[in-house]
Interface confidence: low
């Protein structure tokens, strides 16, 4: 930020009424008045170029220092070319000297050269030649010097002429401040610039209203340089929750908007399914029936539990059931839908029911399912099963109601036996089978049906209580169709697949396991 100048003395602005001291009086510097831009302007001038040994002094009034440590002196002046004067005026000079003296009191008209310290010799960049002077095109020079540190209550400046033709149009003395500043939503107070060039004054900033230092962030600080410039900003403030940055201030979020944390972000419009927020809201409340899960960001629309799975089918296959369903028609506005399957079995005779999770087997864990189908096996025959599929999402836990659909299925058959060929010969086939253990108690016999492949007119049946049988008196090198079926008190169970097994040819021998 640009330095602020605090003016201590401005000759040009004073309209010639400062009454500076001249020494010697009336013989050197004197106050002149001219019109520039339709206004009177004043200047102190001296032009004793034809006389040698000039030592003319012009002293300002006493200037109160106040809080200044380093002062800056800006001079605007003209210097006429010595060649403008006859013979070049051998004693003519084209420079003058600038001095200062500090004091705790005003000496009035008591002028003592010895109290003054030279600041510099002031030389013009451009001199006004005779033709320019006659055409009123004077060359105005601007020079600036600085002095510091100052320690007394006030000071004087003085100008020494040693034989030049000078007009001093403006003398402006000022000191510099780093101006009051708002940066990074922090307020930095007006600060006096230091007097030593290398030093930078560290200044702490304060967050503007409704702004805070973010957690873990640095407190705002800036450095005030000698020239009144703010440098090296450190840290910042952010608008607190419920407020957003508007220019250099934090403004409350408008109704219908919110901001949930201190950040650089603007306020956001309240998401869907929220109630209109008041001014300065940090969040937007959900509409009735809508919820926000703990992990949901405040910017996310409020959501609700899903409706029940849209369509549920249970297809029985022996002692297995395949459950299939379609997603809920209303997802509740969320994508984190999962399904849970529960099972209840009922005895047809008594109507007694109970959970069956322990006795059945699911193709995948029945809770937290993301797919829309599951196979349930190891079901007992001649039982009624009711399956419940519940749809849940991230906000289902926030309500007591559940969204589910049920499907019932009666298991009238055992699961088909799984059949294996244990061994064979030229005239026999050894066959075994298995069914799930829960169903075995309901089977009293197994019926094995077999026939030659291609012969649909005749077949043979063998019954056994065991889990294997050897079929004898078979033709060599012949394929037989074999099926095993469980028999229960209630009738026939499900039959196995029809398997093709072939006896060995006469060249082969022995009982070979397959």
């Amino acid at each position: 930020a640009q330095g602020k100048e605090v003016v201590l003395l401005d000759f040009a602005a004073a309209g010639g009424e400062l009454g500076w001291l001249t020494h010697p009086y009336g013989k050197g510097w004197d106050l002149m008045q001219n019109i520039m831009n339709d206004m009177p302007i004043y200047m102190y001038s001296v032009c004793n170029v034809m006389s040698g040994d000039q030592d003319n002094w012009l002293r300002t009034n006493w200037v109160y220092r106040g809080e200044a440590e380093r002062i800056f002196i800006e001079l605007k002046f003209t210097v006429r070319d010595c060649n403008s004067f006859p013979g070049g005026a051998s004693s003519c000079k084209e420079t003058f000297n600038l001095y200062y003296a500090e004091s705790d009191l005003d000496y009035g008209t008591n002028f003592q050269k010895r109290l003054f310290t030279k600041i510099d010799t002031i030389a013009p960049d451009e001199i006004t030649v005779s033709s320019d002077f006659e055409a009123r095109h004077v060359k105005l020079n601007v020079e600036e010097r600085s002095v510091g540190p100052l320690t007394r209550k006030g000071f004087y400046l003085a100008f020494q002429d040693i034989g030049a033709c000078v007009a001093l149009l403006s003398v402006r003395v000022y000191y510099k401040k780093c101006p009051e500043l708002l940066q990074g939503l922090a307020h930095f107070p007006e600060t006096i610039a230091g007097s030593d060039a290398p030093s930078l004054a560290t200044v702490a900033g304060t967050c503007v209203d409704h702004a805070v230092v973010p957690p873990g962030g640095e407190e705002p600080r800036m450095h005030c340089a000698v020239d009144g410039e703010w440098l090296v900003p450190i840290g910042q403030c952010l608008c607190q929750a419920g407020y957003e940055k508007v220019e250099d201030a934090c403004q409350a979020c408008s109704p219908g908007f919110f901001k949930f944390e201190a950040s650089e972000s603007p306020c956001l419009e309240c998401p869907e399914h929220t109630l209109p927020s008041p001014e300065g809201a940090t969040s937007c409340e959900c509409e009735e029936g809508f919820f926000r899960a703990p992990q949901d960001p405040a910017s996310m629309p409020c959501t609700r539990p899903p409706s029940a799975p849209h369509y549920l089918t249970a297809v029985g296959m022996g002692a297995k059931v395949e459950l299939r369903w379609t997603p809920p028609q209303d997802s509740g506005g969320r994508e984190d839908i999962v399904y849970s399957v529960t099972c209840e079995q009922c005895w047809p005779e008594s109507g007694e029911c109970g959970p069956c999770e322990a006795s059945v087997r699911y193709s995948e864990p029945p809770h937290g399912l993301t797919r829309t189908s599951v196979t349930v096996s190891d079901l007992e025959p001649h039982m009624n099963y009711t399956f419940t599929v519940e749809a849940r999402n991230g906000v289902s836990g926030l309500v007591t109601s559940r969204s589910f659909r049920t499907a019932s299925v009666s298991i009238n058959q055992t699961e088909p036996p799984k059949v294996r060929l244990e061994g064979r010969s030229t005239t026999s086939l050894s066959v075994s089978w298995s069914i799930p253990p829960p169903q075995q108690s309901r089977v009293w016999k197994y019926e094995v049906t077999y026939r030659k492949k291609g012969d649909s007119n005749s077949y043979n049946v063998r019954r056994t209580e065991g889990f294997s049988v050897t079929l004898d008196d078979l033709a060599p090198d012949t394929t037989y169709l074999v099926q095993v079926q469980a028999l229960t008190q209630e009738g026939q169970g499900a039959g196995s697949k029809v398997h093709e097994f072939q006896t060995l040819s006469p060249e082969g021998s022995g009982n070979l396991a397959v």
């Epitope: 309209g15 010639g16 009424e17 008045q33 001219n34 019109i35 831009n37 339709d38 206004m39 009177p40 009123r136």
Partner: antibody, heavy 120, light 109 residues
Amino acid sequence: QVQLVQSGGGLVQPGGSLRLSCAASGFTFSSYAMHWVRQAPGKGLEWVSVISPAGNNTYYADSVKGRFTISRDNSKNTLYLQMNSLRAEDTAVYYCARASVGATGPFDIWGQGTLVTVSS
Amino acid sequence: SSELTQPPSVSVAPGQTVTITCQGDSLRSYYASWYQQKPGTAPKLLIYGENNRPSGVPDRFSGSSSGTSASLTITGAQAEDEADYYCNSRDSSGTHLTVFGGGTKLTVL
């Protein structure tokens, strides 16, 4: 309404004195430089004097220097011209005028004029 | 002090264009102002600066300047424009005076 209303003119003997007044209204009087301009019968306009807005700077035409004094009372919004040692050649209509910009004009507001006759 | 010189009189037919001139060294440095004065009344500002008209001044009045000369031009003169016209300028001689020209009597025939 911006206006300048003059008073104080009349007949005066040579060597005598007269004080002209110019009352301003409708504008911030203390912000403007004010002038007196005169016009001898059948002649052109002649600038007489100027006073700065605060009253701390005054200038005069050589023809009146040392005899006329321009002054102003910003608290009364009034401009004055004190004329001493009057001569026959001072006979004229005297106008007060406002300098619209800076010290020297242009003169955008004029008084109605007041006749000063110096005669024995 | 500087002097500004104007022709004592000019005339113009109604509806015609007329130019009144003003000569003086001070015009090298400063623009002229122009005033109209009708008999028995105070002067009225017509033109100031480069060519500026106060509100209420008809646009048939215009000003220009070049070197040591300034001009007031009336384009399409009207009977009510018959009056005395004065130029005025700051004095460039450094004596802090403002000077008037001698005035020009405009007659609309």
